[in-house]
């Protein structure tokens, strides 16, 4: 008889997930040689660890720390960028303006980047099926717990001048509750970090209005102000010029250093 | 390193036309949105035209549109201005100009500059 | 469009600061850059992106950009620093503006 399991309403775990994270983690490893003396099974097991056997709405951070020690990795703390609803657009940008990083440019983000992944309550199983979505179910969901500790951990970090792309086609340009609006800005360091820079991509190519007037972002410019950080927003036209790069990123079209 | 060679300015009558040409090299031109910029003797610098890398997306400057057309052959590594109708307000050192990478909307390099005289 | 203004002229004695402005609405919502032009020659980028340097160019040139006004900086101003600068911005579109131009002398 097969056993009764909880339906949720998200999408269940990725297909392949062990293997998917285990040969991200092989790849970033052989890649970046600052993360050289990672080992991949240990790391497997700690993600597992974080959410096996567990149920999948009482998920909490503390589950995670195992994972987050082995992830521990130093990025350049002034040369992050954060995004938000604009992810493929920022990773082009990182991709060819190598001295930058988002999240998912660091091991832990790159391990999960568009991955989903659940498990049942006292069984070993991995919830292929289904998995709890985040508004529909429950928020304390393995995914979202393990974004919202990473974001805030990347967030700790950065230094200086950070910089967010936000989108400048959506109606909600800066939406509070965002990973960036509900995490990441409020986990902005004051005694280390100067300045937040947003860049406002625009996506019409005859667009010329100023996206940095728009109220979200003045709602934005106030909770920082209110942290004691400095803002400043930027228009950013002709966002083909990233795409460009990604054909060519060997290119010298693609770093910002003139 | 970048060079940026203009041609093709000269002496010519009100609603004549003139092609300028700009020679690219040291650099992957193809890869670069590239502009005109002329100064009128004695003026300031005046925005024309800018052409994406692959040529798809232009852009004019009201004074000049409807009369200037630009346009790129990357394969020959040069930037065209296709001038008609042209006035003698037109007068003025033309410049071809390389734009700045990624988030930044500036001209790194210019060329030194042909000279169009408009008059009868 | 954006209009960026200038002042024609600025003098500085050698070896002290000269500070040349350019002022637009809301301009600091832009990306600003500075170029220097010596008579019968091209223009030559010194600041772009507001305050970045390219390579080549001397320390001594500084820039900023808060509120409705940029400002190209010369600190320790030298005979040779004597030329037409303009600075430029790019509020999308068609929309490529440049300022009038500021004469700097060198006294």
């Known amino acids: 008889v097969p056993r009764w399991r909880q339906q949720w309403s998200g999408p269940g775990t990725t297909k392949r997930f062990p293997e998917t994270v285990l040969a991200r983690c092989v790849k970033y490893t052989e890649i970046h040689p600052e993360m050289r003396h990672v080992d991949c099974q240990s790391v497997w097991d700690a993600f597992k660890g974080a959410f096996i056997s567990k149920h999948p709405c009482n998920i909490t951070e503390e589950d995670y720390q195992p994972l987050m020690k082995l992830g521990t990795q130093t990025v350049p703390c002034n040369k992050i960028l954060l995004w938000s609803r604009i992810k493929d657009l920022a990773h082009q940008f990182t991709q060819v303006q190598r001295d930058m990083f988002t999240l998912e440019d660091t091991l832990l983000g790159y391990l999960a980047d568009d991955l989903t992944w659940c498990g049942e309550f006292n069984t070993s199983k991995i919830n292929y099926q289904s998995c709890p979505d985040w508004r529909k179910d429950c928020s304390n969901n393995p995914v979202s717990v393990f974004w919202k500790t990473v974001s805030r951990r990347f967030a700790e970090a950065a230094c200086d001048v950070v910089h967010v792309m936000l989108n400048g086609s959506r109606s909600k340009i800066f939406d509070k509750n965002s990973t960036f609006g509900s995490v990441e800005v409020h986990n902005l360091q004051p005694e280390k970090v100067q300045t937040l820079e947003a860049w406002v991509i625009h996506g019409g190519r005859e667009d010329s209005r100023d996206l940095c007037q728009d109220p979200t972002i003045k709602e934005l410019e106030s909770i920082i102000s209110k942290r004691n950080i400095q803002f400043s927003c930027k228009n950013i036209y002709r966002p083909d010029k990233f795409l460009q790069c990604v054909k060519n990123p060997e290119d010298s079209s693609c770093t910002s250093e003139i | 390193q970048v060079q940026l060679v203009e041609s093709g300015g000269g002496l010519v009558q009100p609603g004549g036309s003139l092609r300028l040409s700009c020679a690219a090299s040291g650099f992957t031109f193809s890869s670069y949105y590239m502009n005109w910029v002329r100064q009128a003797p004695g003026k300031g610098l005046e925005w024309v035209s800018a052409?994406?890398?692959?040529?798809?997306?232009?852009y004019y400057a009201d004074s000049v549109k409807g009369r200037f057309t630009i346009s790129r052959d990357n394969s020959k590594n040069t930037l065209y201005l296709q001038m008609n109708s042209l006035r003698a307000e037109d007068t003025a050192v033309y410049y071809c100009a390389r734009d700045l990478p990624l988030v930044y909307t500036g001209f790194a390099y210019w060329g030194q500059g042909t000279l169009v005289t408009v008059s009868s | 469009d954006i209009e960026l203004t200038q002042p024609p002229s600025v003098s500085v004695a050698p070896g002290q600061t000269a500070r040349i402005s350019c002022s637009g609405d809301n301009l600091r919502h832009y990306y600003v850059y500075w170029y220097q032009q010596k008579p019968g020659q091209a223009p030559v980028l010194v600041i772009y992106?507001?305050?970045k340097r390219p390579s080549g160019i001397p320390e001594r040139f500084s820039g900023s950009n808060s509120g409705n006004t940029a400002t190209l900086t010369i600190s320790g101003t030298q005979a040779e620093d004597e030329a037409d600068y303009y600075c430029?911005?790019?509020?999308?579109?068609?929309?490529?503006?440049f300022g009038g131009g500021t004469k700097l002398t060198v006294l």
């Open positions: 992106g507001d305050s």
């Open positions: 052409i994406s890398h692959d040529g798809n997306v232009k």
């Open positions: 430029q911005t790019y509020t999308g579109g068609a929309s490529l503006v």
